[in-house]
Interface confidence: low
């Protein structure tokens, strides 16, 4: 339904508060280096303009597209060229090329200072002094660091952020109340950002068909009682929502997401029995709840899949009639029967089925050709099952920190060209799969682990894409979305790698390490471990363990010393010499 003024339409649908928040997120995700005050000024100007259009949709410029209006506004920033360099060239383009240009310049790893959390009293004072500015600052800081964060979900995070301060700044022990809540929001926020980044990568790098296939599989697992037609409808709508958000169309995205939540709740009887509680919540909570809802129970007595997809004489006729629909039905039927499989495994099975039909439906005897297609699935299912079993055993044996270290060594040997901060970040996140998923029973382990690994490996892919240094990473990231994890798992030690020159400075530590949090100290040690492997890729596990144990003892000893700095200087030299000897450097 066409509207005379798109900006007026969205302002009315979303309301002023959400409109302003979403425009701020959009601007901060595009111009990640701009100061907060500049963004607030731009947002206020856009909001005032939107209000004139609400009053009179025929007013001047009210008929322009949102991309045109927002792009024109962004291009008024005076310091565009000195701050962003070639991104300023986007402003010479016309829509839609200009928006595409802005999207291409989004930076997954912007050069921004780490967010340091002030003292609780300082935060509470700032919150009470100007609640609106305080919350806007939160949106701005998250959006600029996470340029693909799912905007309507960020509104939900902001609502929880506000609730935390409202409650805890009145508490007797403000810190005990607030800090755990902020930690939880931070961790959930990072996870949410990474999950959305995979959705956007899927759409942008592999296309709508890839995203729709993922959505069919996931929604069929979640809503196994829903009919195929219902799942297809939800997939179409969900694809639209995510395409919009990934494309920077945040107002349309938030509006359509609200419509989808409304539709789901109005039709929950034909979708899932698990939606009742979600549907009683306010909009932002409702949408979040639906996105996280547990899988419904599988219908009883589902017939064998073989009847329609292997034994039927009409398989090739049905496939030829509407290939993607038939494959969609296969994926739907398989996924609703297998909540115990990861989505990526289900997609691999569907791909195998598709390849088999392509080959067999052109054969002399198609049925004989595809009769054993389900046998081809067995090794595909067993591979992730075995991998998860082995790694969960290793995790249970080592604990999270040492499990992360094992993965650090493993991945540094596979792709040693990748930057040390990226290897540390990605391996630490890969290692978190243990505490996240190994606690689950067998039936929940694979969907938890393999789909989480897909999210983490996508982080590696998007960071590597910015500065490509390894052909092996490029190959695993670009060849097949669903086979990324098996591709990385299959990589052996890179024999072509020339070890890094030894640099004593890399292994020089100071007393400041003693005041770091446990997490920061771990990161320091893990950074040293990656550097060790880059210097000595053929070092054995035992050699690396000995050096790391010595390193931990050295840090502990010097942090207890009276003259810490002298201890780090003197004992550090001894440690470097001993490590070189142990590793034969």
């Amino acid at each position: 339904d066409a509207h005379k003024s798109e900006v007026a339409h969205r302002f009315k649908d979303l309301g002023e508060e959400n409109f302003k928040a979403l425009v701020l997120i959009a601007f901060a995700q595009y111009l990640q280096q701009c100061p907060f005050e500049d963004h607030v000024k731009l947002v206020n100007e856009v909001t005032e303009f939107a209000k004139t259009c609400v009053a009179d949709e025929s007013a001047e410029n009210c008929d322009k597209s949102l991309h045109t209006l927002f792009g024109d506004k962004l291009c008024t920033v005076a310091t565009l060229r000195e701050t962003y360099g070639e991104m300023a060239d986007c402003c010479a383009k016309q829509e839609p090329e200009r928006n595409e240009c802005f999207l291409q310049h989004k930076d997954d790893n912007p050069n921004l200072p780490r967010l340091v959390r002030p003292e609780v009293d300082v935060m509470c004072t700032a919150f009470h002094d100007n609640e609106e500015t305080f919350l806007k600052k939160y949106l701005y800081e998250i959006a600029r660091r996470h340029p693909y964060f799912y905007a309507p979900e960020l509104l939900f995070f902001a609502k929880r952020y506000k609730a935390a301060f409202t409650e805890c700044c009145q508490a007797a022990d403000k810190a005990a109340c607030l800090l755990p809540k902020l930690d939880e929001l931070r961790d959930e926020g990072k996870a949410s950002s990474a999950k959305q980044r995979l959705k956007c990568a899927s759409l942008q790098k592999f296309g709508e068909r890839a995203f729709k296939a993922w959505a069919v599989a996931r929604l069929s697992q979640r809503f196994p009682k829903a009919e195929f037609a219902e799942v297809s409808k939800l997939v179409t709508d969900l694809t639209k929502v995510h395409t919009e958000c990934c494309h920077g169309d945040l107002l349309e995205c938030a509006d359509d997401r609200a419509d989808l939540a409304k539709y789901i709740c109005e039709n929950q009887d034909s979708i899932s029995s698990k939606l009742k509680e979600c549907c009683e919540k306010p909009l932002l909570e409702k949408s979040h709840c639906i996105a996280e809802v547990e899988n419904d129970e599988m219908p009883a007595d589902l017939p064998s899949l073989a009847a329609d997809f292997v034994e039927s004489k009409d398989v090739c006729k049905n496939y030829a009639e509407a290939k993607d629909v038939f494959l969609g039905m296969f994926l739907y039927e398989y996924a609703r029967r297998h909540p115990d499989y990861s989505v990526v495994l289900l997609l691999r099975l569907a791909k195998t089925y598709e390849t088999t039909l392509e080959k067999c439906c052109a054969a002399a005897d198609p049925h004989e050709c595809y009769a054993k297609v389900f046998d081809e699935f067995k090794p595909l299912v067993e591979e992730p099952q075995n991998l998860i079993k082995q790694n969960c055993e290793l995790f249970e044996q080592l604990g999270e920190y040492k499990f992360q270290n094992a993965l650090l060594v493993r991945y540094t040997k596979k792709v040693p060209q990748v930057s040390t901060p990226t290897l540390v970040e990605v391996s630490r996140n890969l290692g978190k799969v243990g505490s996240k998923c190994c606690k689950h029973p067998e039936a929940k382990r694979m969907p938890c682990a393999e789909d989480y690994l897909s999210v983490v490996l996508n982080q590696l892919c998007v960071l590597h894409e910015k500065t490509p240094v390894s052909d092996r990473v490029t190959k695993c990231c670009t060849e097949s979305l669903v086979n990324r994890r098996p591709c990385f798992s299959a990589l052996e030690v890179d024999e072509t790698y020339v070890p890094k020159e030894f640099n004593a400075e890399t292994f020089t530590f100071h007393a400041d390490i003693c005041t770091l949090s446990e997490k920061e100290r771990q990161i320091k040690k893990q950074t040293a471990l990656v550097e060790l492997v880059k210097h000595k890729p053929k070092a054995t596990k035992e050699q690396l363990k000995a050096v790391m144990d010595d390193f931990a003892a050295f840090v502990e000893k010097c942090c207890k010393a009276d003259d810490k700095e002298t201890c780090f200087a003197e004992e550090g030299k001894k440690l470097v010499a001993a490590s070189q000897a142990a590793l034969g450097l």
């Epitope: 009919e227 195929f228 037609a229 049905n318 009639e321 509407a322 629909v325 039905m329």
Partner: nanobody, 123 residues
Framework: QVQLVESGGGLVQAGGSLRLSCTAS????????MGWFRQAPGKEREFVAT????????SYADSVKGRFTVSRDNAKKTVYLQMNRLQPEDTAVYYC?????????????????WGQGTQVTVS
Amino acid sequence: QVQLVESGGGLVQAGGSLRLSCTASGRTYEPLVMGWFRQAPGKEREFVATITPSGGSLSYADSVKGRFTVSRDNAKKTVYLQMNRLQPEDTAVYYCAAAPGVGNYRYTRQYDYWGQGTQVTVS
């Protein structure tokens, strides 16, 4: 839900013709396989004809082959059953059915949505 409404039934003499229509409304998301079934008094509901979503594939019960033709107009969300050379044994309540997917569905269990039926009497 998808609602199906049949029309076009009536009383006709043997050898005559009738054209049944079935229109889908409500949440009709393509692709829908459409089928016609019939049920004579005291008998089981039996398959008559089916048509795939694009109309590219048709299937008929042996008893009506060469006499009945199924077709569809997706723009109007309507499926038709043209019945020629009608015989007294064609007397029954005719039901329209729909199912999401593709394929020639010949069994009642394969269909999710059903119309109320329209009476056809051949004298």
